[in-house]
């Protein structure tokens, strides 16, 4: 029950996170005009990853796309790439995790397969979240650098009475959406990975006695197969080295591949 809840919650949190990453990537307000030096401007500028916009006080908003690839700063291209990779990985992760959900039965899919898929989607969510956080952080760093550079050059060329105030940009709403969304996707991924441990088929303890067969040093289990799966370490024939009879409890259990996340 706890596993199902953890997995379900991880899926929902990741879903919200990825929706947020998509929203942040599409938003125009990655950077907004800093109004500290000119709070009475009648024109407000803001920029996104794909276009820049100008909102006039009169209510008119004009947006222009960046219709060039080569002319854009490498950092902006990098941020775009990180966000897109984050979205793609997240989308694939969501698709995989839908099939991995314990509450959804698809054919005769075994728990080990669901565990694998849960782990895979969890890792994808973690990487997706990290991509979004990295992308937003790179953009934020770029803004901070440019902000202080433009502050230093703010009144350059003030030969006479005329002032030319450079437009400075500060953090836009999309950055905060991106950070939160990336964090949620990351948390969702971690939850999926935790849920994966609980989904992994565990050793079932059978109190059946293993008998040493003459001529073979192999222990046979009577009816020792799991009802629903053909996998798991219990189905393996285990070698008994001392030739004596012992209960299955005493036989060393080999670690499952899902025991370590």
């Amino acid at each position: 029950m706890a596993v199902t809840a953890c997995q379900g919650l991880g899926f929902v949190v990741s879903l919200i996170g990825i929706a947020g990453i998509i929203a942040a990537t599409c938003m125009d307000q990655w950077s907004t005009q800093d109004l500290y030096n000119n709070p009475v401007t009648a024109v407000f500028n803001y920029q996104g990853l794909w276009r820049s916009c100008v909102r006039e006080s009169s209510g008119f908003t004009e947006c222009r796309g960046y219709f060039t690839l080569l002319g854009l700063p490498a950092m902006l291209q990098a941020v775009r790439a990180l966000m897109i990779v984050g979205i793609v990985l997240g989308a694939i992760g969501l698709l995989v995790s839908i099939f991995a959900l314990k509450c959804i039965r698809i054919g005769s899919m075994e728990d080990s397969a669901k565990a694998n898929m849960t782990l895979t989607s969890g890792i994808m969510f973690i990487v997706s979240g990290l991509c979004a956080i990295a992308g937003v952080s790179v953009f934020a760093n770029m803004l901070v650098t440019n902000f202080w550079m433009s502050t230093a050059n703010m009144y350059t060329g003030m030969g006479g009475m005329v002032q030319t105030v450079q437009t400075r940009y500060t953090f836009g709403a999309a950055l905060f959406v991106g950070w939160v969304a990336g964090g949620l996707t990351l948390i969702g991924g971690v939850m999926m990975c935790i849920a994966c441990r609980g989904l992994a088929p565990e050793e079932t303890n059978y109190k059946a006695v293993s008998y040493h067969a003459s001529g073979h040093s192999v222990a046979y289990k009577p009816g020792g197969f799991k009802a629903s799966t053909g996998f798991g370490s219990n189905t393996k024939n285990k070698k008994i080295y001392d030739g004596g009879a012992r209960t299955e409890d005493e036989v060393q259990s080999y670690p499952s591949k899902h025991d370590y996340v």
């Epitope: 000119n38 024109v43 006039e56 006080s57 008119f60 004009e62 105030v165």
Partner: antibody, heavy 117, light 113 residues
């Protein structure tokens, strides 16, 4: 078509409050801003203030303590209130709609307000 | 506040001749976001309200004859009437539409020589 019409008392006593109304038609009050501009007799234009579509206002720095601009969307009206008037406030008062580039693209005919005792 | 200075105060030009009015702002009116200058030109005839001629320094308002043109960037702007007509006699004002208060220039009175 867009129309603006100013109305109000033509004569106001010094130290009283000047109240004007601008009745508009042909555009949405929630989408566009309206500015108030005055012109003293024989002089140039002076921008007083503006109320935007979202209800926010901006006033001329010299009049900020005396000027209030508001709107009544249900009546399609904008109003200007200028307190503690003096003879220097005698002018033709215009209301005008803000358009592209924040430019004033439609103007009312104006109303002359004289401040005198 | 941005101070708008117009020159000359008055101008007399012969019919059919070119008329040029200048406007200078104390701060740049160029918006870096869209590379547009937030300067507007108005025409006011006696007894009438002002009429919008040009916004964004060079964009003609619809219905305005093409003999009117605006130019300039940053702090220096010009309104040009390529061939003066009798109906162009008026006072012309420039306005800062970039920063509040949206100040007007002092006006230039255009007459026929």
């Amino acid at each position: 078509q867009v129309q603006l019409q100013e109305s109000g008392p033509g004569l106001v006593k010094p130290s009283e409050t000047l109240s004007l109304t601008c009745t508009v038609s042909g555009f949405s009050l929630t989408s566009y801003g309206v500015s108030w501009v005055r012109q003293p007799p024989g002089k140039g234009l002076e921008w007083l203030g503006v109320i935007w579509g979202d209800g926010s206002t901006n006033y001329h720095s010299t009049l900020i303590s005396r000027l209030t601009i508001s709107k009544d969307t249900s009546k399609s009206q904008f109003s200007l209130k200028l307190s503690s008037v003096t003879a220097a406030d005698t002018a033709v008062y215009y209301c005008a709609k803000a358009g592209r580039g924040n430019a004033l693209d439609y103007w009312g005919q104006g109303t002359l307000v004289t401040v005198s005792s | 506040d941005i101070v708008m200075t117009q020159s000359p105060d008055s101008l007399a030009v012969s019919l059919g001749e070119r008329a040029t009015i200048n406007c200078k702002s104390s701060q740049s009116l160029l918006n870096s976001g869209n590379q547009k200058n937030y300067l507007t030109w108005y025409q006011q005839k006696p007894g009438q309200p002002p009429k919008l001629l040009i916004y964004w320094a060079s964009t003609r308002e619809s219905g305005v004859p093409d003999r009117f043109s605006g130019s300039g960037s940053g702090t220096d702007f010009t309104l040009t009437i390529s061939s003066l007509q009798a109906e162009d006699v008026a006072v012309y004002y420039c306005q800062n539409d970039y920063s509040f208060p949206l100040t007007f220039g002092g006006g230039t009175k255009l007459e026929i020589k």
